[in-house]
């Protein structure tokens, strides 16, 4: 129900890394925020990664997560790594204000991430 903004399109780097900003308009003074990245394909939604952070502190994903991020005010800079061409799709930023009450939830319109697998290097003859 909160407004959440994210870019419409992002092109992953040749190393399979994509970064985008997720910005939310907070109705209140949240101290604990949860950010989740969802991937939507047709009617299927899967969780890519999630992190909870205290306002003013760093965003920490689990060690084995493919995501990293930093936060600044109501803005979260998200990076997804290890992407392959088959991971091309719509990535949705979900923001939840967990504490204190009231609970608020916002869903972005999604960022279409395009991933192009790098061409294998041709053999060189010297």
């Amino acid at each position: 129900a909160m407004h959440v903004a994210q870019p419409a399109v992002v092109l992953a780097s040749s190393r399979g890394i994509a970064s985008f900003v997720c910005e939310y308009a907070s109705p209140g003074k949240a101290t604990e925020v949860r950010v989740t990245v969802l991937r939507q394909a047709d009617s299927q939604v899967t969780e890519v990664c999630a992190a909870t952070y205290m306002m003013g502190n760093e965003l920490t994903f689990l060690d084995d997560s493919i995501c990293t991020g930093t936060s600044s005010g109501n803005q979260v800079n998200l990076t997804i790594q290890g992407l392959r061409a088959m991971d091309t799709g719509l990535y949705i930023c979900k923001v939840e204000l967990m504490y204190p009450p009231p609970y608020y939830l916002g869903i972005g319109n999604g960022t279409q991430i395009y991933v192009i697998d790098p061409e294998p290097c041709p053999d060189s003859d010297f």
Epitope: P27, G28, Y103, I107
Partner: antibody, heavy 115, light 108 residues
């Protein structure tokens, strides 16, 4: 302690108006989107409408069943939300609850629309 | 508007039973779902918010799961004080924040 107290309910004739008030205490009223929810006798819960707060320009939203007849407003300085009900119909008979976010609920006030 | 369909509309179970109530949305709602408990003659009370988060003071026998369009409220071991009607509600913008039709839970 969080408290939401609704008032203004009663018996009213079809076509007439009524204004409900919801007085809040024990939490930061201005941080909350205020909702009105109603429950007709023996029926389920029905979301009536919502007023958001200042960061959201006090946007209001209504269910189709009350759109154009009901108006929600708020006074953050007094921590009060209002539900102005015009052109009342018999099917508006219900217990009306106000809620802060959807976390906090008042005890409800009964509105009976009958001739 | 997104429709919320709850099932069953009523159920009767024994004390200690595991009870499951489902709520389906007509479109993807990304976990934007609350569950409420309303005991007879009482005010509704928030049980679960954001599909999976237990509200303050709610016993741990209650849990919520699901994402996308299909959601579940589970009572792991039904207690006499759990006799109530349970409602799901979509909390995704834009409103309306529609409620499901309710599930009445009784003890056998």
């Amino acid at each position: 302690e969080v408290q939401l107290v609704e008032s203004g309910g009663g018996l009213v004739q079809p076509g007439r108006s009524l204004r409900l008030s919801c007085t809040a205490s024990g939490f930061t009223f201005s941080d909350n989107w205020m909702n009105w929810v109603r429950q007709a006798p023996g029926k389920g819960l029905e979301w009536v409408g919502q007023i958001r707060n200042k960061p959201y320009n006090y946007e209001t939203y209504y269910s189709d069943s009350v759109k154009g007849r009901f108006t929600i407003s708020r006074d953050d300085s007094k921590s009060i939300a209002y539900l102005q009900m015009n052109s009342l119909k018999t099917e508006d008979t219900a217990v009306y609850y106000c809620t802060g976010g959807m976390d906090y609920w008042g005890q409800g006030t009964t509105v009976t629309v009958s001739s | 508007d997104i429709q919320m369909t709850q099932s069953p509309s009523s159920l009767s179970a024994s004390v200690g039973d595991r009870v499951t109530i489902t709520c389906g949305a007509s479109e993807i709602i990304y976990g934007a779902l609350n569950w409420y408990q309303q005991k007879p003659g009482k005010v509704p009370k928030l049980l679960i918010y954001g599909a999976t988060n237990l509200a303050d003071g709610v016993p741990s026998r209650f849990s919520g799961s699901g994402s996308g369009t299909d959601f579940t409220l589970t009572i792991s071991s039904l207690q006499p004080e759990d006799v109530a009607t349970y409602y799901c509600q979509k909390i995704l913008s834009p409103p309306p924040w529609t409620f499901g039709g309710g599930t009445k839970v009784e003890i056998k």
